[in-house]
Each structure stands twice: as C-alpha cells, then as structure tokens.
Amino acid sequence: EVEKTACPSGKKAREIDESLIFYKKWELEACVDAALLATQMDRVNAIPFTYEQLDVLKHKLDELYPQGYPESVIQHLGYLFLKMSPEDIRKWNVTSLETLKALLEVNKGHEMSPQVATLIDRFVKGRGQLDKDTLDTLTAFYPGYLCSLSPEELSSVPPSSIWAVRPQDLDTCDPRQLDVLYPKARLAFQNMNGSEYFVKIQSFLGGAPTEDLKALSQQNVSMDLATFMKLRTDAVLPLTVAEVQKLLGPHVEGLKAEERHRPVRDWILRQRQDDLDTLGLGLQGGIPNGYLVLDLSMQEALS
C-alpha cells in the first residue's frame, strides 16, 4: 500500500505523459487522478514505467473500479495486464474480441499464464460458446489451446468453429477429446465432396468409429500411415485386410515398418494369416489357418 500524501505544488498530472516516469511512487499516488488514468490508459503502454510504478497505477484503477474494470479500460491495459491476478480478471466482463486480442498480444510468446487462462474462460463463458472467430484467435496465439479443454468444454464448440482448426492444433489432443471433436468435424464438413472432405476430416480421424473407417475405405482416400497410426485401436481392430488395403491404397506398404506398433500390431493379431499374406508384405503374427475365431465382444452385445 502507498501512503496517502498530498501532491506537491505544481506536480498534479494534467495528462498521462512521459514526465510521469520521473515521479516517485508516492507522487504518482498523490498526483495522478484515477479517472484521468482510466480515460488515457492507451498512453500508459507507450511510457517506460517501472514495475513499481505500474503497481501504483493498478492500485489507482482498483480503487476507482472495486467491482472490476470496464471494457474501455481493459482494452487498453497493455503491459499493465501482466500485473493483474486471476482474481482481478474474474471481476471483468470482456465481450469484445478486439479486447481479447489486445491482451493476448501482451502475453505473446509466453506459456499460457493463469491470468490468460482466466481471461479466456471469462470471455468464452460470456459468449456462451466457443465460436469460430474466437477459436481462430485463440489457436493463433496458443496452438494447443483446443487440446487444453475438457471433453465437456469441447462439447459446446459449434461445428462452424472447426473450420478454424489446423492439423497442428490437434497434436496434443488425447482420444477422449478427439471423440468429441470428430463428430463436430463430420457435421462441419458434410457439404463437401469426397476428396475435399477427406483432406479436412483427416486430422480428426483419431475420433472415428469403425463404421466411418469402413465407409471411408470405399472412397479411394489413400490414407497416409501417419494418420492410420493415430486411429483408435478399437476402431481399427474390426477392419478386414481388404478394408485396410482400400483405406491405405498405395500407402499399405508402410504397414511393414509399423508392424510392431499399435494399432498395426494389434490389428495383425486379429487377422487370419492367409489374409495378411495376400498383401505380400511379409506381415507375421496373424491367426494360423484352421483356427476358429470367437468374437466375445459381439457375443456380449447380443446377450
């Protein structure tokens, strides 16, 4: 806390300008009117205040707006944003995407701080859902943002937002998140034709069920091995050798290099060796000829 002291004669600030960097902390407290500061917040960023001086300016704003800053002030906080605590930010009502962008810019290049996480949470909750423009903005600043959300939070993502998602935005998503995002992507891209559709849906296929992989295998999509390796093991296991061959097209040869890794390894174990031999890749580990295969999962479903 800065002690309350009278402003020395002639030092009362008429506007926010560079002369204030020579003020001591107590002089800033005494001589800068909080209302003036609020109306001229856009100037603060251009002035090289010390961290201690920024603390004083924040204190003045806190006193002026005990219930939380108005958006007109928030939009121009600049580096003062770094002084805010998550508790401060929870009092805000940020509705403008421009305000969000301005504050994210301040933190650019750094990990997502608790302040930024709180700001984003407030913004998204205020909007009611994660719309396309917001998602576009957030993934531009934080490519891993989407994968930081819980499956429950992802469920409120409207399909139109999926158009903003780039393949790298999904790199850190786990299967539970892709399970939620994949149906959204299917909805979003449903008006596209075969080849265009596959290009767009490819990044989300880690959430695809067996039925969809079977349907895709009929479309001559030529899935690459990197995509195939990201598919859900439980979705790949029921695929026949012929279906995998159709799904991968010319990339089927890559199975040999991946035969010890999931899901390829587990899939091989489920196939008849005779069927695997038809690929001519030397894949080993299939069910020997003459053995009976009991699908217990199917039996459970029927009982």
Partner: antibody, heavy 122, light 106 residues
Framework: EVQLVQSGAEVKKPGASVKVSCKAS????????VHWVRQAPGQGLEWMGI????????TYAQKFQGRVTMTRDTSTSTVYMELSSLRSEDTAVYYC???????????????WGQGTLVTVSS | SYELTQPPSVSVSPGQTASITCSGD??????ASWYQQKPGQSPVLVIY???RRPSGIPERFSGSNSGNTATLTISGTQAMDEADYYC?????????FGTGTKVTVL
C-alpha cells in the same frame, strides 16, 4: 424392422422441464447419430440438435442452446432429450430420428420415432 | 439466419409430374434432403445428398440441386403421394428445414 419407440405424451406447466426418451428396438448397437426435431401444431419441422453414437458429443441449434440437453444410455440403446424452462411456444410433437443411410459425410434422417406430444399449459 | 423457401402448395393430376422447388442462398453448394409427411404421421426421408434415394423409396422420386434451387420431382404421381414435403440442408451450425409444400393429387 428397426424402430424408434418414444415415450408417451406429456403435459407440463410453464417453467418446468420435460424429458423425452427414444429407444431403438430391433437393433441393439449404438452406431448411429440421433437427431431431435420438433413440430408445433400446424407448423413445419424444426431441428433441435444431434448426439453422436457414443453420446460424448452433442451439437444443439443456437435457438435451444442452454435449454436443451441430449444424453444417451448405450447400455439400453436409449437417447434422451430434456428441455427446460418450458413456455407455451414449446407445445409441439417432438421426434427423434436416426441417420442410418450409407455415406461417410451424410446425416440424413431416415428412421423416425412416432413422436411425443408435449403440451405446455398453465 | 439461413432460410429455405418452398411454394406453399402444388397441385398435380394422377400420372403427371410434380416439381417442388426449394430456394436458398447458394443452396447448390450444400447437400439437400427431402422429407415426405402425411397427416398424423412421422416424416419419411425420400431423397438425400441432392439425388440419392433410400432403399424402399420408389424410383418416381428424384432430386436435383444447383445454383440457389433444389428440386424434388415426382414423376407419374400417385394418390398416395399426397402429403407435405420439406427440403432440408445444413448451414453453419444447424439443419434448416424448408417452409413446406402441400402436394395435392387432383
């Protein structure tokens, strides 16, 4: 033949909630997307939302956002649609419909329930 | 919000061809579906993805979609085809149904 069997008619007071169920008979596998569509008396069809086969992903029409919740019990092959804060304008027949037609990017509704009349009246 | 407009009614003589239009901004860039609904019954899908017929739907039902208009054609119309017909398409985050057309077989 595959059928979707819906719960019976409901009469509700304004402000209350209603939960309509839709059970698949003749096919116990939870492999299809399920839509909910409503039709007010003498009016056209209005889409409310969709739930995916595993029940983890839902998409709701903007108009119903915050008021509708769709859930799925895969053990009983039943889908539920709950609508809260009911008003008189919500009086309608509510249909569930499945997308079973073949197609990798297709959600056409080709199997429909018989409909559930929900009347909202004080 | 996206809108699909249909004529309120279309009349056709038995054995003749009925054409029902559905207009919407750049509708040809989207896939259109068509549903038939008879009084007191649930809707029935008759056309999906512009021109594909589900199994069990008679060949006399066909569809097309280009520009701003999708069209459902019923050739050799029968008395049993008398019903309301709704077009439908996906736009942005919702399925939009057309305003509906009552087909009367004279």
């Amino acid at each position: 033949e595959v059928q979707l069997v819906q719960s019976g008619a409901e009469v509700k007071k304004p402000g209350a909630s209603v939960k309509v169920s839709c059970k698949a008979s003749g096919d116990t596998f939870n492999r299809y997307y399920v839509h909910w569509v409503r039709q007010a008396p003498g009016q056209g069809l209005e889409w409310m939302g969709i739930i995916n086969p595993s029940g983890v992903s839902t998409t709701y029409a903007q108009k119903f956002q915050g008021r509708v919740t769709m859930t799925r019990d895969t053990s009983t092959s039943t889908v539920y649609m709950e609508l809260s804060s009911l008003r008189s304008e919500d009086t309608a027949v509510y249909y569930c419909a499945e997308s079973r037609v073949p197609g990798y990017n297709n959600f056409a509704m080709d199997v429909w329930g018989q409909g559930t009349l929900v009347t909202v009246s004080s | 919000s996206y809108e699909l407009t249909q004529p309120p009614s279309v009349s056709v003589s038995p054995g003749q061809t009925a054409s029902i239009t559905c207009s919407g901004d750049k509708l040809g860039d989207k896939y259109a579906s068509w549903y038939q609904q008879k009084p007191g019954q649930s809707p029935v899908l008759v056309i999906y993805q512009d021109n594909r017929r589900p199994s069990g739907i008679p060949e006399r039902f066909s569809g097309s979609n280009s520009g701003n208009t999708a069209t459902l054609t019923i050739s050799g119309t029968q008395a049993m085809d008398e019903a309301d017909y709704y077009c439908q398409a996906w736009d942005s985050d919702t399925y939009v149904f057309g305003t509906g057309t009552k087909v009367t077989v004279l």
